[in-house]
């Protein structure tokens, strides 16, 4: 068990024109909230499927009014972290999806008007008790900047939350066959026994000394097989006189939830309470495996033979982490010589040369750059018995004096639109999609690229999805 | 404006079949969020939820109840029929209907307009 | 079923004071909802989500709480306030209420 947990850091315009119009004004004050969902696995479903992983919504936060005249600023926010509790194993793979909600304080009567201003998701790899990750998500105009992170819930520890820790009942080491609890040290491994007896098949335990029976079994043991034989038919009506109950169609009908777990139904959906080791909407997840496809970057998955993982990644160069998310910061060795500036681009180390410096690690000393000026920071470089100027970003041509156009190579897919910026070039990209150059597809197989329609919203007002 | 008003028999027999029906006005039941639900209160006694419709036809029923009642929605009417089964004496009360929203599956955000109320007797 | 424990049952107090009420889940619930209902009249809502108040309601109603333990005050008691209070959770079918509390002028 544990809490994923999700810190907002700000929520306003992006970079770039076309700044979005404050959503609150003078005349229809509003406060925002957030509504974060998470689901196991690395599938990209569509926004309306259920929060399989759990879900959660944030405070209200503080009423804001919009300043005439004001371009719209970074919003007040509420206070305090997302959390979303967790009842078994951390996946170790997710999906997320950040709703940003506002609710307007009009004097209408009745229930609060809400709508949708920004819906951002994304697909992470995050292995339980690490550091603070912090991301930033663009949806339209909007720019959302957030931290998260997954924690276990003592006595559960290791990057799934799946080992128990116990103090040590001896100072000096732990009982036989148990390690320590890294990184807790005077903790020690609890091994999980279930009561005596205790059929392996049909019973599992989610504290020691209990015997919880898997469907169609009982008794104290789950040894003893549920009968049925009182019941005329498994669909018939419900008799009084035999005492079967059966209901009619629902969506815990026939129990969906396998591995034991127990259904209740929700306002809309189905809920599944899921026995230990298991999670998913279904509890039909008994762990992230290699099936899962859960190493970034190329990394090769081999299973693995320590408890706490079913999978281990090899990561290729220049990649780190459990899962290879990490991109090593190579340039940390400082490969380029003469105070040349390093540059990691992923599939190789460059290094901008300083005036008077060339060679692929800046080795080369060169003197013939003394009298050329190189405009707006740009360095001269000697190669071939000709020198020229290495531009900064963003700029071009012989002496660096023309501004180059980062979007004519036209880098932003599926009809995202480009705009130059101080530090490259960013994409906003078209509805239905995201990413850096808007190559994921928010929705895929077919499903709408479109959230469903807000509540509150009468018939006839307009709905704009951002 | 939201309104929504309950309309039907103020007295039924026992073991008949009361049919009750919401009209509203202010919201759509094709709106994705929305929803309608049926609440009733004995005399005297605390509010008891019976069931409710979605706007794409996900249907709720109190288990208690599940084997007597049926819900429906006719979108284009706004309207939200129930019906409840061989009725008793103990099933007296006010009933309501209300106005639900839903953010998704898994959070009602708010039950936030209500019928005035329709008083059913069930007697002989 | 989720039981939804409400206290006190009835409740006499005076303009001005400073009211609390309770409401126990019998396990744990996302989010709490507060209605409050004058004889003869329909419920009406007070707090949605546990602590979020509805449109028109005045903000000496405020509404707290997590898991299984919620609690409805109100800061200061106005004339217009006496009447039976109700919770109800949203987590689980069937979907409770509680059995009321009755708020009483002393």
């Known amino acids: 068990a544990g809490v994923f947990e999700l810190q907002i850091h700000s929520f306003g315009p992006g970079p770039g024109p076309g700044a979005p119009r404050s959503p609150c004004s003078a005349r229809l004050p509003c406060r925002l909230f957030f509504r974060v969902c998470l689901k196991p696995g690395l599938s990209e479903e569509a926004a309306e499927s259920p929060c399989a992983l759990g879900a959660a919504l944030s405070a209200r936060g503080p009423v804001y009014t919009e300043q005439p005249g004001a371009p719209a600023p970074d919003l007040p926010l509420p206070d305090g972290l997302l959390q979303v509790p967790f009842r078994d194993a951390w996946p170790g793979t997710f999906s997320f999806i950040i709703e940003t909600w506002r609710e307007e304080l009009g004097d209408q009567i009745g229930g609060p008007a809400w709508s949708l201003l920004a819906r951002v998701a994304g697909r992470r790899r995050l292995a339980a008790g690490g550091p603070w990750a912090r991301d930033i998500q663009r949806a339209g105009a909007w720019e959302l900047r957030f931290s998260y992170r997954a924690r276990c819930e003592p006595p559960a520890v290791g990057t799934a939350c799946t080992r128990l820790c116990r103090p040590r009942s001896a100072p000096s080491r732990c009982g036989p066959g148990l390690r320590p609890c890294a990184p807790l040290e005077d903790e020690c491994e609890a091994p999980l026994v279930c009561r005596a007896g205790c059929s392996p098949e049909h019973g599992f335990c989610e504290q020691p000394g209990e015997c919880r029976c898997l469907e169609g079994w009982t008794g104290p043991l789950c040894t003893v097989p549920v009968s049925t034989s009182s019941c005329l038919s498994p669909r018939g009506p419900s008799s009084a006189t035999t005492g079967c109950l059966v209901p009619g169609p629902g969506p815990c009908d026939g129990n969906p939830c396998a591995n034991g777990g127990s259904c209740s139904e929700t306002p809309r959906s189905f809920e599944c309470t899921c026995p230990r080791g298991f999670y998913g909407l279904r509890c039909e997840v008994s762990g992230v495996t290699c099936a899962d496809g859960p190493c970034f970057n190329g990394g090769l998955c081999v299973g693995g033979a320590d408890p706490d993982s079913a999978y281990i990644c090899h990561c290729p160069p220049g990649f780190q982490g459990s899962n290879c998310e990490k991109r090593v910061d190579r340039c940390s060795l400082q490969p380029c010589r003469n105070g040349g500036l390093c540059l990691d681009l992923g599939h190789a180390l460059r290094c901008r040369c300083r005036a008077g410096f060339a060679g692929p690690r800046c080795e080369h000393d060169l003197d013939d750059c003394a009298g050329r000026a190189c405009a707006n920071g740009g360095t001269c470089v000697e190669g071939g018995g000709a020198h020229r100027c290495s531009c900064a970003l963003g700029f071009g041509g012989r002496d660096c004096r023309e501004r180059a156009d980062p979007c004519a190579a036209r880098p932003c897919a599926h009809g995202g639109r480009c705009y130059a910026h101080f530090s490259g070039l960013v994409c906003a990209c078209a509805p239905g999609y995201m990413g850096a150059r808007c190559e994921f597809p928010v929705h895929p197989d077919g499903a709408s690229a479109l959230p469903a329609a807000p509540p509150g919203l009468r018939p006839g007002d307009p709905q704009r999805y951002l | 404006q939201i309104t929504l008003k309950e309309s039907g028999p103020t007295l039924v027999k026992p073991t008949q079949t009361l049919t009750l029906t919401c009209t509203f006005s202010g919201f759509s039941l094709s709106t994705s969020g929305m929803g309608v639900g049926w609440i009733r209160q004995p005399p005297g006694k605390a509010l008891e939820w019976l069931a409710h419709?979605?706007?794409?036809?996900?249907?709720r029923y109190s288990p208690s109840l599940k084997s007597r009642l049926t819900i429906t929605k006719d979108t284009s009417k706004n309207q939200v029929v129930l019906t409840m089964t061989n009725m008793d004496p103990v099933d007296t009360a006010t009933y309501y209907c209300a106005r639900i929203v839903s953010f998704d599956n898994d959070v009602v955000s708010a039950m936030d307009y209500w019928g005035q109320g329709t008083l059913v007797t069930v007697s002989s | 079923d989720i039981q939804m424990t409400q206290s006190p049952s009835s409740l006499s107090a005076s303009v001005g004071d400073r009211v609390t009420i309770t409401c126990s889940a019998s396990s744990h619930v996302s989010y709490m909802y507060w209605y409050q209902q004058k004889p003869g009249k329909a419920p009406k809502l007070l707090i949605y989500?546990?602590?979020n108040l509805a449109s028109g309601v005045p903000s000496r109603f405020s509404g707290s709480g997590s898991g299984t333990d919620f609690t409805l005050t109100i800061s200061s008691l106005q004339p217009e306030d006496f009447a039976t209070y109700y919770c109800q959770q949203w987590r689980s079918n069937p979907f409770t209420f509680g059995q009321g509390t009755k708020l009483e002028i002393k």
């Open positions: 419709i979605w706007w794409d036809d996900v249907k």
């Open positions: 989500l546990t602590s």
